[in-house]
């Protein structure tokens, strides 16, 4: 569910939402660390309805959800898995 991408693209997100999205509506969450052309961390939620939402990384709900997902993945995998996307 969690994907971390390192890209050389500029910022992808123009508008960010802080509204809670239930997990059953989420396909995957893409994390773009800051740097490489974008001065801020970006979180993109790909929904099952094929729409995409940029989420404010400071939004409480996404921080709480990612903490749950991190705990879950660390209990099943010895190291985090990062997916690299070549620009």
């Amino acid at each position: 569910v969690l994907e971390v991408y390192y890209t050389s693209l500029r910022c992808r997100c123009v508008q960010e939402s802080s509204v809670f999205i239930p997990r059953r509506f989420i396909d995957r969450i893409q994390i773009l660390p800051r740097g490489n052309g974008c001065p801020r961390k970006e979180i993109i939620v790909w929904k099952k309805n094929k729409s995409i939402v940029c989420v404010d990384p400071q939004a409480e709900w996404i921080q709480r959800m990612m903490e749950v997902l991190r705990k879950r993945s660390s209990s099943t995998l010895p190291v985090p898995v990062f997916k690299r996307k070549i620009p």
Partner: antibody
Framework: EVQLVESGGGLVQPGGSLRLSCAAS????????MSWVRQAPGKGLEWVAE????????NYAPSLKDRFTISRDNAKNSLYLQMNSLRAEDTAVYYC?????????????WGQGTTVTVSS | DIQMTQSPSSLSASVGDRVTITCKVS??????VAWYQQKPGKAPKLLIY???YRYTGVPSRFSGSGSGTDFTFTISSLQPEDIATYYC?????????FGGGTKLEIK
């Protein structure tokens, strides 16, 4: 203007069946999850079931899933609830509601409800 | 199932009063809580979603807060038209569940 209009309610004997319908207008029905929620006389709200746009994901209240079936026909902009083996405790007003998965992620539009009475 | 314990079950207040309703949840639901208003013989109306976001057209006197297991709904200055029953609802996961409701009356 969004409109959800329920129909099909009425008086039915215990053990009987009933099929409720919800006709949607003013929304792109085929894009949205839909839910049924019921309310027994003088009681609170109870969620019954939900269905996604493609009818590939369906969730029920555990106590009802053996007797109730939710379905939809996107070509007719209609939502349905088939209720079998009805009991007195199923007596309630049944509401259909749009389950928004674009902006609010909960039930933002509701119909006016249709009344189901289960009695001998 | 996730249980929603809403309190009080009924409340009498005067016009202009600040009114607070609480909802305690049996497990962490993040900020996946909505609040609805229902008037007699009518369908529920969405007021608050994602714990604290006012739905379109909802007056600013209505507000919500909370996360995890404790949520609060507030009417900052009660108006006569606010007489209704209010419900909290979690939509974090299915089965979706509602609180028992709070019936609000004018003193």
């Amino acid at each position: 203007e969004v409109q959800l209009v329920e129909s099909g309610g009425g008086l039915v004997q215990p053990g009987g069946s009933l099929r409720l319908s919800c006709a949607a207008s003013g929304i792109d029905f085929s894009r949205y999850w839909m839910s049924w929620v019921r309310q027994a006389p003088g009681k609170g709200l109870e969620w019954v079931a939900e269905i996604n746009p493609e009818s590939s994901t369906i969730n029920y209240a555990p106590s009802l899933k053996d007797r109730f079936t939710i379905s939809r026909d996107n070509a007719k902009n209609s939502l349905y609830l088939q209720m079998n083996s009805l009991r007195a405790e199923d007596t309630a007003v049944y509401y259909c509601a749009r389950q928004d998965d674009y902006e609010h992620y909960t039930m933002d539009y509701w119909g006016q409800g249709t009344t189901v009475t289960v009695s001998s | 199932d996730i249980q929603m314990t809403q309190s009080p079950s009924s409340l009498s207040a005067s016009v202009g009063d600040r009114v607070t309703i609480t909802c305690k949840v049996s497990q962490d639901v993040n900020t996946g809580v909505a609040w609805y208003q229902q008037k007699p013989g009518k369908a529920p109306k969405l007021l608050i979603y994602s714990a604290s976001y006012r739905y379109t057209g909802v007056p600013s006197r209505f507000s919500g807060s909370g996360s995890g297991t404790d949520f609060t709904f507030t009417i900052s200055s009660l108006q006569p038209e606010d007489i209704a029953t209010y419900y909290c609802q979690q939509y974090y996961s299915t089965p979706l569940t509602f609180g028992g409701g709070t019936k609000l009356e004018i003193k």
